[in-house]
């Protein structure tokens, strides 16, 4: 004959555990029913009566089968730099994530505790590493032959236009200006579109290598002529 199904509450066999969605109540020394997600234990079980469950109140939740006396409080409302990606219900906590243009500077178990605006690269610098949900933008100096004239968290260094006749040479923060005749092409040949590791606010020099010093990057330079020096400060 099949074993008789025990109904909660029941005393477990010595050495055995309670079944799925049951818990062992130390006081009653019985296996008792857990409450379903969205509920909590209003009255704990006894030897003769099972757990009495009740729905979570507004702004509280339980996400798992449980026997907690009170539901958990939902997190505070999302701040102005966040968007609510999961609402507070009886079965789940509110989840706040950072709005576009921001990243999570301090995360929590789910969602984000503190959002920060993505760094904007100033002119002469371009985005070398885009921001993600959890990391900031990294800006790098524009390479010779490239420029950025914006303050932006997305703009990379762009190649100078190539002129038949140059009216004003380009620099790291300004495109070349051609004379009235149109440029031969809009991009320097071989210029890399991604942000470059070399900048040109003035004539840039590679340091004399020492043990463990930053490597020379001459092989990374785009082809084409380097722009002349932009006047650096100094007396």
């Amino acid at each position: 004959l099949p074993a008789q199904v025990a109904f909660t509450p029941y005393a477990p066999e010595p050495g055995s555990t309670c079944r799925l969605r049951e818990y062992y109540d130390q006081t009653a020394q019985m296996c008792c029913s857990k409450c379903s997600p969205g509920q909590h234990a209003k009255v704990f079980c006894t030897k003769t009566s099972d757990t009495v469950c009740d729905s979570c109140e507004d702004s509280t939740y339980t996400q798992l089968w449980n026997w907690v006396p009170e539901c958990l409080s939902c997190g505070s409302r999302c701040s102005s730099d966040q968007v609510e990606t999961q609402a507070c219900t009886r079965e789940q906590n509110r989840i706040c994530t950072c709005r576009p243009g921001w990243y999570c500077a301090l995360s929590k178990q789910e969602g984000c505790r503190l959002c920060a605006p993505l760094r904007k690269c100033r002119p002469g610098f371009g985005v070398a590493r885009p921001g993600t949900e959890t990391s900031d933008v990294v800006c790098k100096p524009c390479a010779p032959g490239t420029f950025s004239n914006t303050t932006s968290s997305t703009d990379i260094c762009r190649p100078h236009q190539i002129c038949n006749v140059v009216a004003i040479p380009g620099n790291a923060s300004m495109d070349a200006v051609c004379t009235s005749t149109s440029p031969t092409r809009s991009m320097a040949p071989g210029a890399v579109h991604l942000p470059q590791p070399v900048s040109t606010r003035s004539q840039h020099t590679q340091p004399t290598p020492e043990p463990s010093t930053a490597p020379s990057t001459s092989f990374l330079l785009p082809m084409g002529p380097s722009p002349p020096a932009e006047g650096s400060t100094g007396d």
Partner: antibody
Framework: QVQLVQSGAEVKKPGASVKVSCKAS????????IHWVRQAPGQGLEWMGW????????DYADKFKKRVTMTADTSISTAFMELSRLRSDDTAVYYC????????????WGQGTLVTVSS | DIQMTQSPSSLSASVGDRVTITCNGS??????LAWFQQKPGKAPKLLIY???SLQTGVPSRFSGSRSGTDFTLTISSLQPEDFATYFC????????FGGGTKLELK
């Protein structure tokens, strides 16, 4: 927290060279450029140049181009500024400062290194 | 090269006074102007960047403004700890500090 710690004071003779170090901690060293700024006794601040530690690329003020070399060692998160052919008017406190290339500029500075040039 | 002319070079004031320091750029520098405070024997400290933005942790009595190529640092009500030297700094086209303004107790 973010810290830039510079090497100790130096006394040099005219014509010699000096190398000042700036050790960074509390942030990703290669994500920021390092500026060097100096201040002669009782004078204002003078920008000397910057280095991008990631690749070692530099931008020097015209005044210092022939005499300054800025380097970085990413393995120890340290930037270096070497000034050669020292003169008495190079006597100054030399500072390093970090810059993330956003509108937020030089938000953390080293404590300064006094370099005295005297015969 | 862009020159930054800072005025006055020195200034005497009392606690509670409203103080303004001005920096004029020889060329357009957009909003790429910062203000630093320096106390004797200490490194400069960033107060304001991008003309108007207050650096984290800096008291709100400090503010920055602009009119054309004239940039102003205002301290609305001087506190004892504000007596120091102040420098403007342009970082739009190369890099250049103003000459400094020494703020002394009257």
């Amino acid at each position: 927290q973010v810290q830039l710690v510079q090497s100790g004071a130096e006394v040099k003779k005219p014509g010699a060279s000096v190398k000042v170090s700036c050790k960074a901690s509390g942030y990703t060293f290669t994500d920021y450029i390092i500026h060097w700024v100096r201040q002669a006794p009782g004078q204002g601040l003078e920008w000397m140049g910057w280095i991008d530690p990631d690749y070692g690329n530099t931008d020097y003020a015209d005044k210092f181009k022939k005499r300054v070399t800025m380097t970085a060692d990413t393995s120890i998160s340290t930037a270096f500024m070497e000034l050669s052919r020292l003169r008495s008017d190079d006597t100054a406190v030399y500072y390093c400062a970090r810059d993330d290339a956003s509108p937020l500029v030089m938000d953390a500075w080293g404590q300064g290194t006094l370099v005295t040039v005297s015969s | 090269d862009i020159q930054m002319t800072q005025s006055p070079s020195s200034l005497s004031a009392s606690v509670g006074d409203r103080v303004t320091i001005t920096c004029n750029g020889s060329q357009n520098i957009d909003n790429y102007l910062a203000w630093f405070q320096q106390k004797p024997g200490k490194a400069p400290k960033l107060l304001i960047y991008s003309t108007y933005s207050l650096q984290t942790g800096v008291p709100s009595r400090f503010s920055g403004s602009r009119s054309g190529t004239d940039f102003t640092l205002t301290i609305s009500s001087l506190q004892p700890e504000d007596f120091a030297t102040y420098f403007c700094f342009q970082y739009n086209n190369g890099y250049m500090f103003g000459g400094g303004t020494k703020l002394e107790l009257k």
